[in-house]
């Protein structure tokens, strides 16, 4: 951007510049071209020697300029147009300047002026061109600086040329106010900071509703001496609730939102949200719908699932296999898990209570992802009720629960009562008993044993009787022994696990029950 301090051509002859000597050297002239007056300062005293004609501009306020550019448009006539080449004729003129803090008015003193340059034309106007009105216009530019006073004058010295000065334009350069990457850069005077640093670094200001991204660099640009912006660094982003539209940040329209400062546009409110107001940073969930803490704001709001479908409990002696299908309504989420709880009731008293501690699950009964689980170690003559609850990421945000229940009665044998009959260093003789009324239902007994503390030495023996001798055991070793009745329906109740110890090789006769 050029900031013009003086423009002779634009002033339409209204500038009364000082001429010295008055009226005999430079003077203002008017010509009409295309019905428009063209003004020029001209001088053409080529036949008289010793010309020293000065034309001084009015005082020009410097404003913020440090270096100024002077553009001259002028014509110079060929000295050969004049008789004998006019020995005193010249084809150049001199350009001067003087700085001052005040306007000296008509007080003109040559000694105050410093020469900028001798101005020579690229093209001179020869006689034939002049008479054919085909004058050759020259354009020359000079730079002056640094300036330090409040203002300055320019002066043109004629020493015997035939010159017409049509345009004098004085300006300085600024990098214009600019919007770039949502940052506003102020109008900046184009100055070289130093010879080695020809660029001025300028910090930008984020436009309304834009911010420097977290951890990012603030916007910077470089203003060159030629008044051009270069090398943008950093950026601004539209803050939450606003999106970039051309060079501004505009509030998200109703029904749209933006949750963070980013380059992304506003997003439409997802499903199951209420219509947002202008400039929304999120969209509220509809009643009955929720957002889990880890859910992105762009995700639809969801709700807890309905209860599992078709829960079945299949009794297999002292075991039950629970099977169910996924809820009809998943609540719009994929993160469904199931949890199983167990309640047992005594038929005689009708008393009920939780049974998690006494039963065994084939896998942990909380946060199940599969739709089946086996429950074992059920007690005979007991009614069990199993509840399977479906949960998802937003279930914790409501108090109601979505579960289905199934009940099963266990008409199993009572667990065998086991005791150690005899032992040696390498064997254990174990006996058991069950109520006579249940004996007819028992098909066989299954004895499982292993060394205590050794999960890999698992052994099973089956027998139809009420005793078994376990051989080939290690001396002075504790074994874990359990007896379970096998019935037509499957496994019956198992006895509790007993610890029996073989004798040491010294032959101690102690019995452990």
């Amino acid at each position: 951007k050029e900031v013009v301090l003086l423009d002779f051509a634009a002033m339409k002859g209204e500038l009364g510049w000082l001429t010295h000597p008055y009226g005999k050297g430079w003077d203002l002239m008017q010509n009409i071209m295309d019905d428009m007056p063209i003004y020029m300062y001209s001088v053409c005293n080529v036949v008289s020697g010793d010309q020293d004609n000065w034309l001084r501009t009015n005082w020009v306020y410097r404003e913020e300029a440090e270096r100024i550019f002077i553009e001259l448009k002028f014509t110079v006539r060929d000295c050969n147009s004049f008789p004998g080449g006019a020995s005193s004729c010249k084809e150049t003129f001199n350009l001067y300047y003087a700085e001052s803090d005040v306007d000296y008015g008509t007080n003109f003193q040559k000694r105050q002026f410093t020469k900028i340059d001798t101005i020579a034309p690229d093209e001179i106007t020869v006689s034939s061109d002049f008479e054919a009105r085909n004058v050759k216009l020259n354009v020359e530019e000079r730079m002056v600086g640094p300036l330090t006073r409040k203002g300055f004058y320019l002066a043109f010295q004629d020493i015997g040329a035939c010159v017409a000065l049509l345009s004098v334009r004085v300006y300085y350069k600024k990098c214009p106010e600019m919007l770039q990457s949502l940052a506003r850069f102020p109008e900046t005077i184009a100055v070289a900071v130093s010879d080695t640093q020809p660029l001025a670094t300028v910090a930008g200001t984020c436009v309304d509703h834009a911010v420097v991204p977290y951890g990012g660099e603030g916007p910077l640009m470089h203003c060159t001496v030629d008044g051009e912006w270069l090398v943008p660094i950093g950026q601004c982003l539209c803050q939450e609730g606003y999106e970039k539209v051309e060079d501004a940040c505009r509030a998200c329209s109703p029904g749209f939102f933006k949750s963070e400062a980013s380059e992304s546009p506003c997003l439409e409110c997802p499903e199951h949200t209420l219509p947002s107001t202008e400039g929304a940073t999120s969209c509220q969930c509809e009643e009955g719908y929720f957002r889990a803490p880890e859910d992105p704001l762009s995700m639809s709001c969801t709700r807890p699932p309905s209860a599992p479908n078709y829960l079945t409990a299949i009794g297999m002696g002292a075991k039950v296999e629970l099977r169910w299908t996924a809820p009809k309504d998943t609540g719009g989420r994929q993160d469904i898990v199931y949890s199983v709880t167990c309640e047992q009731c005594w038929p005689e008293s009708g008393e009920c209570g939780p049974c998690e501690a006494s039963v065994r699950y084939s896998e942990p009964p909380h946060a199940l992802t599969r739709t089946s689980v086996t429950v074992s170690d059920l007690e005979p003559h007991m009614n069990y009720t199993f509840a399977v609850e479906a949960r998802n990421g937003v279930s914790g945000l409501v108090t109601s629960r979505s579960f289905r229940t199934a009940s099963v009665s266990i008409n199993q044998t009572e667990p065998p009562k086991v005791r150690l009959e005899d032992r040696s260093t390498t064997s254990l003789s174990v006996t058991w008993s069950i109520p006579v009324s249940q004996q007819s239902r028992v098909w066989k007994y299954e004895v499982t044993y292993r060394k205590k503390g050794d999960a890999n030495s698992y052994n099973v023996r089956r027998t139809e009787g009420f005793s078994v001798t376990l051989d080939d055991l290690a001396p002075d070793t504790t074994y874990l022994v359990q007896v379970q009745a096998l019935t037509q329906e499957g496994q019956g109740a198992g006895s509790k696990v007993h610890e029996f110890q073989t004798l040491s090789t010294e032959g101690s006769a102690n019995m452990a029950v």
Epitope: D27, M29, Y39, N45, V47, T106
Partner: antibody, heavy 120, light 110 residues
């Protein structure tokens, strides 16, 4: 409208003095250089003097230098020519004229003229 | 010298073209201005610069210049054009500020 109205002419004896006035109207008087031009009876036009727009510069024809003084009062929009040591050859119709641009003209507005007769 | 020389008189038949000339060294450097003066009135500017006419001046008046000569041409002269015509120019010698030609009396015959 734009005009120059002159006054102050008359008969004066040789060696006498006279002051001519030229009242301007219809334009910004203080922006223009002003001239006096005279015309002896039956003769051509002769340039006499010029004054710059602000009164800071004055020039005279050799024939009147030292005897005539050109001045102006921009607050009154008036141009003056003080003529001293008048001679018979100064007898003429005196015109004030406006230089349309610069110092030297052209002269686009002229007064109606006022006759100065120097005779004993 | 700083003189401008004009013919003392010229004549023209109505409707014909007439040219009045002005000679002088200053005209090599500066354009002439032309003035018309009718008896008992002040001069009136006709032409200035390259060939510029102030508003109100009929376009039958035109100016030209070449070397040390300037010309005023009246194309299709009319009876009311009978008057004295003066050329004027800046003085390139620096002796004077401005100079007038001696004037030319134009007679429109008939």
């Amino acid at each position: 409208q734009v005009q120059l109205v002159q006054s102050g002419g008359g008969l004066v004896q040789p060696g006498g003095s006279l002051r001519l006035s030229c009242a301007a109207s219809g334009f910004t008087f203080s922006s223009y250089a002003m001239h006096w031009v005279r015309q002896a009876p039956g003769k051509g036009l002769e340039w006499v003097a010029v004054i710059s727009y602000d009164g800071s510069n004055k020039y005279y024809a050799d024939s009147v230098k030292g005897r005539f003084t050109i001045s102006r009062d921009n607050s009154k929009n008036t141009l003056y020519l003080q003529m001293n040591s008048l001679r018979a050859e100064d007898t003429a119709v005196y015109y004030c004229a406006r230089a349309s641009v610069g110092a030297t003209g052209p002269f686009d507005i002229w007064g109606q003229g006022t006759l100065v007769t120097v005779s004993s | 010298s700083s003189e401008l020389t004009q013919p003392p008189s010229v004549s023209v038949a109505p409707g014909q073209t007439v040219t009045i000339t002005c000679q002088g060294d200053s005209l090599r450097s500066y354009y002439a201005s032309w003035y018309q003066q009718k008896p008992g009135t002040a001069p009136k500017l006709l032409i200035y610069g390259e060939n510029n006419r102030p508003s109100g001046v009929p376009d039958r008046f035109s100016g030209s210049s070449s070397g040390t000569s300037a010309s005023l041409t009246i194309t299709g002269a009319q009876a009311e054009d009978e008057a004295d015509y003066y050329c004027n120019s800046r003085d390139s010698s620096g002796t004077h500020l401005t100079v007038f030609g001696g004037g030319t009396k134009l007679t429109v015959l008939g």
